[in-house]
Interface confidence: low
């Protein structure tokens, strides 16, 4: 969470941004809020990116002004126009690219004053893992797969019964480059598993952490998975 203040004559407004992460190839949001102003025509929103000459996006007089927009962002940005008057200056970014990572500034000017705040935007790829029982193996094993990760993550296994055990010797992890030559498919196999146990496959890079759990009993297999972005907020 970053809060910035600006001064315009005697007036300043608070602008707040949140560090966030974008998933390559998907749409992302750069979050920014400010003190509301009912005079829409007096609100100017400018998004800038460090190292880029030209604007990421500009909204003023109630509409987008993309005359100074950098080519990198052409056709890929939008503000939530109907929410500007209530203080939402967040930017929607289509088709997130690896090169979108960096430091952005959300600059606001209203009839009340002006202010700005920076945010760090990380880009990468992250996806939910899925664990299945691998019946093709000579011994009972589990296969954890996640389709898209970047940068290359670490993969670790854990077990509810053998807490603190190191499974690196009885697991094998591979990374297969996807067709776009950036992201990779993660596959990890855990051997010699026992029934009536819950196993977790944890995939983590500097952007996200994902965990897949599988509970194997004589009668059923239960699965769950979760994903959280790191250093966000």
């Amino acid at each position: 969470l970053i809060i910035g203040f600006g001064i315009s004559g005697k007036h300043f407004i608070t602008v707040t941004t949140f560090t966030s992460a974008g998933n390559i190839g998907e749409d992302g949001t750069l979050s920014c809020t400010f003190e509301p102003d009912i005079k829409l025509n007096g609100i100017v929103i400018q998004w800038l990116k460090e190292g880029i000459k030209g604007l990421v996006h500009e909204f003023k007089e109630g509409k987008d002004d993309l005359s100074q927009q950098h080519e990198m962002f052409r056709g890929r940005t939008a503000v939530f126009a109907d929410q500007v008057v209530v203080g939402n200056a967040s930017l929607r970014l289509k088709n997130v690219q690896l090169t979108d990572a960096g430091t952005y500034t959300c600059y606001i000017r209203t009839s009340k004053g002006k202010g700005n705040a920076n945010l760090e935007y990380k880009t990468g790829a992250f996806s939910m893992p899925e664990i299945n029982v691998d019946y093709n193996a000579s011994s009972e094993s589990l296969r954890c797969e996640a389709p898209r990760w970047f940068p290359q993550p670490t993969v670790a296994w854990a077990s509810q019964v053998d807490q603190g055990a190191n499974f690196s010797e009885v697991s094998n992890t591979s990374f297969e480059l996807n067709s776009e030559n950036v992201t990779m498919k993660v596959v990890s196999v855990l051997y010699n598993v026992t029934i009536n146990n819950t196993y977790s496959c944890m995939i983590e890079n500097d952007i996200a952490k994902a965990t897949g759990d599988i509970k194997v009993t004589d009668s059923e297999v239960k699965r769950r998975s979760q994903l959280q972005l790191l250093n966000s907020g």
Partner: antibody, heavy 119, light 108 residues
Framework: QVQLQQWGAGLLKPSETLSLTCAVY????????WTWIRQPPGKGLEWIGE???????NYNPSLKSRVTISADTSKNQFSLRLSSVTAADTAVYYC?????????????WGQGTLVTVSS | EIVLTQFPGTLSLSPGERATLSCRAS???????LAWYQQKPGQAPRVLIY???RRATGIPDRFSGSGSGTDFTLTISRLEPEDFAVYYC?????????FGGGTKVEIK
């Protein structure tokens, strides 16, 4: 096919103003930064500065006080002026196009103009 | 400004040999903004590699780029007669844009 063609005076006396123009044929003028680079005889490359279609300029701090880069978008041309030249400004001057965001490199260059400063 | 130091200054090799050219930055440069050029006498430079490792259009695959942070490398896997020239690295991670001093690859 994008082509950059440049012209201007090749022989100057010390204290005069160097003036070069570069015309852009093919491609969009508005999507790039248009750049001047120079290379003294037998030496390396030095970035002078750049301009985009809206007139935004960026100059090398070492030359900033003497350099003006301007553009005439209606003609797809941009120009370099370097005032108060000395023998140290003798170089081949190139115009070039700084390519888009995914590239940040000079894909297209002019043919180069040798500018000699001599009394 | 970011200073790019290229080494060696001159590389004497025979056709068919492998050439490894180095470029070191005085501070970290995002690989997005690192490029390599080839220049032959009387000609303008020609871009070979951009984004530290991506070959420009029409560049043979014997040319490859690698590196990150402050250390970047241009490799010519097997020198052809037409590859003997001067090579420059260039950054625009921060202004001003700067070039390295160049490495001359000459015939041994």
């Amino acid at each position: 096919q994008v082509q950059l063609q440049q012209w201007g005076a090749g022989l100057l006396k010390p204290s005069e103003t160097l003036s070069l123009t570069c015309a852009v044929y093919g491609g969009s003028f508005s999507d790039y930064f248009w750049t001047w680079i120079r290379q003294p005889p037998g030496k390396g490359l030095e970035w002078i500065g750049e301009i985009n279609h809206s007139g935004t300029t960026n100059y090398n701090p070492s030359l900033k006080s003497r350099v003006t880069i301007s553009a005439d978008t209606s003609k797809n041309q941009f120009s370099l002026r370097l005032s108060s030249v000395t023998a140290a400004d003798t170089a081949v001057y190139y115009c070039a196009r700084l390519s888009s965001w995914s590239n940040w490199a000079f894909e297209y260059w002019g043919q180069g103009t040798l500018v000699t400063v001599s009394s | 400004e970011i200073v790019l130091t290229q080494f060696p200054g001159t590389l004497s090799l025979s056709p068919g040999e492998r050439a490894t050219l180095s470029c070191r930055a005085s501070q970290s440069v995002s690989s997005t903004y690192l490029a390599w050029y080839q220049q032959k006498p009387g000609q303008a430079p020609r871009v070979l590699i951009y984004g530290a490792s991506r070959r420009a259009t029409g560049i043979p695959d014997r040319f490859s780029g690698s590196g990150s942070g402050t250390d970047f490398t241009l490799t010519i896997s097997r020198l052809e007669p037409e590859d003997f020239a001067v090579y420059y690295c260039q950054q625009y991670g921060s202004s001003p844009l700067t070039f390295g001093g160049g490495t001359k690859v000459e015939i041994k």
